[in-house]
């Protein structure tokens, strides 16, 4: 009976900061009672520790047992099907779930104008299931860097580009009126991490927001 | 930075096919993969199918398992979703969109940038 069932294809984590998500492909023509079971190793602690013995769905939020993620040497995953008593064998993820694996996002961004110019403030991930000790700012201390898109609306798709390395910072504008959409992009120079672009944010500049001058 | 185009849609006779294209043509993509979803006339958007975009694991609904297959190509950031033995009941928009989030595969909250939608009319 031990492993008749044919094991998930494949299993990864996709990570924000503190939101820890492990995700698997289903087996090929999965009954109605087959569930998975999910299980976790830290690294430096060699066994592997059982988290859910089945979960129906494709995913699992492994944030709450990940929390010491940003001090350690991370972990790996490993999920099998389960269908009564046959089990298959087990599918582990084939990278470490490390720091460097977490992608780089950005809170919200909030953006007003001042004498022609876009001031844009970019407020970091603040999650609620961060200790309180754990803020992004003090996890990744130096070296943070912003990506910057602007689009002009109307003329969809023509873009500029600038980076800057303040959770603050200002577009001049050249005089020119219209509606302003703003993404940003974080990174950390010193690491490796992927980032993520925001949600698009968007001003009106009008000629009331400009002084004039003799 | 993400801006997704959708092309491939028309109208097909059932048990034809179609190949729908899906290119982000924004500088770079940053999701985690990118996923289909579709509107019949008069109804919600649903899931159809979705792809991550590192491993090329893929998800399909149930109602189009089997018919439909979803690939990727990294070098052209682009997805394609290939549509065989098409039925009456897959006539609606199909929607491109990238997964922003880490949440699930098949819900439309872990998507956005959507794309503007290709037609895809299926006769009987």
């Known amino acids: 009976h031990g492993t008749e069932l044919p094991s998930p294809p494949s299993v990864w984590f996709e990570a924000e900061f503190f939101h820890h998500i492990l995700h698997w492909t289903p087996i090929p023509n999965q009954s109605e009672s087959t569930c998975y079971e999910v299980a976790l190793l830290r690294y430096g602690i060699e066994s592997w520790n059982s988290i859910s013995n089945c979960s129906q769905t494709l995913s699992y939020d492994l944030t709450a047992v990940t929390l010491d993620l940003y001090h350690s040497n991370g972990y790996r995953a490993r999920v099998r099907a389960v269908d009564g008593s046959r089990h298959s064998n087990w599918t582990v993820t084939n990278t470490r779930f490390s720091v460097d694996e977490v992608t780089l996002t950005v809170g919200s961004v909030n953006l007003e104008i001042h004498n022609g110019f876009i001031l844009g403030k970019i407020q970091l991930p603040r999650p609620k299931m961060a200790p309180a000790n754990d803020t992004y700012e003090s996890i990744f201390s130096h070296f943070r860097e912003y990506e910057i898109a602007i689009r002009k609306v109307p003329g969809n798709f023509t873009f500029t580009h600038k980076k800057v390395k303040h959770e603050n910072f200002s577009l001049l504008t050249s005089g020119e009126v219209g509606e302003f959409c703003v993404q940003v992009k974080p990174s950390v120079a010193s690491r490796s991490n992927k980032g993520m672009w925001s949600k698009e944010e968007c001003i009106s500049l009008t000629r009331q927001y400009f002084t004039v001058t003799n | 930075q993400v801006q997704l185009l959708e092309s491939g849609g028309g109208l097909v006779q059932a048990g034809g096919s179609l190949k729908l294209s899906c290119t982000n043509s924004?500088?770079?993509?940053?999701?985690?993969?990118m996923g289909w979803f579709r509107q019949p006339p008069g109804k919600e958007r649903e899931f159809v199918s979705s792809i991550n975009w590192i491993y090329g694991a893929t998800y399909y609904s149930d109602s189009v398992k089997g018919r439909f297959a979803l690939s990727r190509d990294k070098a052209k950031n682009t997805v394609y979703l290939q549509m065989d033995s098409l039925k009456p009941e897959d006539t609606a928009v199909y929607y491109c969109?990238?997964?922003?989030?880490?949440?699930?595969?098949?819900?439309?909250?872990?998507?956005?940038?959507w794309g503007q939608g290709t037609q895809v009319t299926v006769s009987s």
């Open positions: 969109a990238a997964k922003i989030n880490g949440e699930s595969y098949f819900n439309t909250g872990s998507f956005g940038s």
């Open positions: 924004g500088r770079t993509f940053s999701g985690y993969g």
